[in-house]
């Protein structure tokens, strides 16, 4: 079996997680992609997904999660903005390929969000401009419910430095709504 590795991201409340998940563009460019959270002993839960088929560079926002799929580059960008301590946990990027089980991209993300608001952008940002243009139009999220039981694993032991994931649900507003963010020319 493939060894599942984790990449740890330590950020403060209010910062932005910005993850780039690479994929083979010839195989998966138009495939539907998703951002999932994995809780100990549970099935991965889909928090946000791209459209089906996935649209090139067309942002999809679900609450505080923004997905951008760049077909030309074979890259899915995932951002979680205005992070909260409750967002701490284990996440993964996947590609839906029914009837086969989802294909996991990248390392799993061990997100640790700590108190202590930072007025600056996330630790991996130095933007001189960071404006999100979000129009008021929304549509229902259409993420497949299908998840293979084989993707359920016992979560690897956490290092002592990790903050454990709270039992409460992640507080993502309007999870059932996707905000279509057009690219402004």
């Amino acid at each position: 079996a493939t060894k599942l590795t984790e990449e740890k991201y330590e950020l403060k409340e209010g910062q932005t997680l910005d993850v780039k998940c690479d994929y083979t563009l010839e195989k998966f460019a138009s495939s539907q992609k998703a951002w999932q959270i994995i809780r100990d002993g549970e099935m991965p839960k889909t928090l946000a997904c791209t459209e089906r088929p996935s649209k090139n560079s067309h942002p999809v926002q679900v609450g505080r999660i923004i997905l951008e799929d760049y077909h030309d580059h074979g890259l899915l960008r995932v951002r979680m903005v205005n992070l909260q301590v409750e967002d701490s946990g284990l996440y993964q990027c996947v590609i839906y390929q029914p009837p086969k089980e989802p294909h996991m991209l990248f390392d799993r993300i061990r997100l640790v969000v700590t108190k202590g608001f930072s007025g600056t952008p996330g630790s991996n940002e130095n933007s001189t401009q960071n404006v999100y243009k979000i129009p008021p139009t929304t549509t229902k999220a259409l993420c497949p419910l299908y998840t293979s039981p084989r993707t359920v694993t016992q979560a690897p032991p956490k290092s002592t430095a990790d903050v454990s994931t709270p039992d409460s649900e992640i507080n993502l507003t309007n999870v059932t709504d996707i905000i279509r963010v057009p690219v402004f020319n």
């Epitope: 780039k20 030309d72 890259l75 960071n130 690219v183």
Partner: antibody, heavy 116, light 107 residues
Framework: EVQLVESGGGLVQPGGSLRLSCAAS????????MSWVRQAPGKGLDWVAS????????YYVDSVKGRFTISRDNAKNSLHLQMNSLRAEDTAVYYC?????????WGQGTLVTVSS | EIVMTQSPATLSVSPGERATLSCRAS??????LAWYQQKSGQAPRLLIY???IRATGIPARFSGSGSGTEFTFTISSLQSEDFAVYYC?????????FGGGTKVEIK
């Protein structure tokens, strides 16, 4: 076929200004992040700046912040780099590249020489 | 800033032989690593992204591996057109940074 053609390079005195331009064709310009990468003579590659499709996100390397401005005109499929307060260490070939994080396509570059 | 260090600076290899290049990051870049080839007088060309995914049209003799801080780029059997300078680049964090390059020359 993707084509990126840079222009605007040349010789300029320290403290002077130059505006580089890049004409893009062969791909959907308005759907792509674009960047500038430079290479000093005989040296390695250095990322300079990146801009999102709609200009809503812009990133610069620290050494050019406040002096260089990246911009784009999606209607004209063009990318620009306004360079002010130029220094000798800005001397390099400047490449226009497609992509905001990694760089799939490169122009042939335009040489900027900062010297008195 | 994430510092990328490539080794060796120069690698002398005979045609047909294997070439192995190394790239080390000062902190983890996950799999957000690319490799480029630059021939004399030409612009660079993307070969590998995501540490191990070959870019479109890149021959199978080029491969990449690694994750975190240690990465390897391999040319399984060097062809005459492969003698060039190779750069690694991380894109996990801004600012984006390149390694200093490895020159692969004919032995």
């Amino acid at each position: 076929e993707v084509q990126l053609v840079e222009s605007g390079g040349g010789l300029v005195q320290p403290g002077g200004s130059l505006r580089l331009s890049c004409a893009a064709s062969g791909f959907t310009f308005s759907s792509n992040w674009m960047s500038w990468v430079r290479q000093a003579p005989g040296k390695g590659l250095d990322w300079v700046a990146s801009i999102k499709q709609d200009g809503s996100e812009i990133y610069y390397v620290d050494s050019v912040k406040g002096r260089f401005t990246i911009s784009r005109d999606n209607a004209k499929n063009s990318l620009h780099l306004q360079m002010n307060s130029l220094r000798a260490e800005d001397t390099a070939v400047y490449y226009c590249v497609r992509g905001g994080w990694r760089f799939e396509s490169w122009g042939q570059g335009t040489l900027v020489t900062v010297s008195s | 800033e994430i510092v990328m260090t490539q080794s060796p600076a120069t690698l002398s290899v005979s045609p047909g032989e294997r070439a192995t290049l190394s790239c080390r990051a000062s902190q983890s870049v996950s799999s957000n690593l690319a490799w480029y080839q630059q021939k004399s007088g030409q612009a660079p060309r993307l070969l590998i992204y995501g540490a191990s995914i070959r870019a479109t049209g890149i021959p199978a003799r080029f491969s990449g591996s690694g994750s975190g801080t240690e990465f390897t780029f391999t040319i399984s059997s060097l062809q005459s057109e492969d003698f060039a300078v190779y750069y690694c680049q991380q894109y996990k964090n801004w600012p984006l940074t390149f390694g200093g390059g490895t020159k692969v020359e004919i032995k």
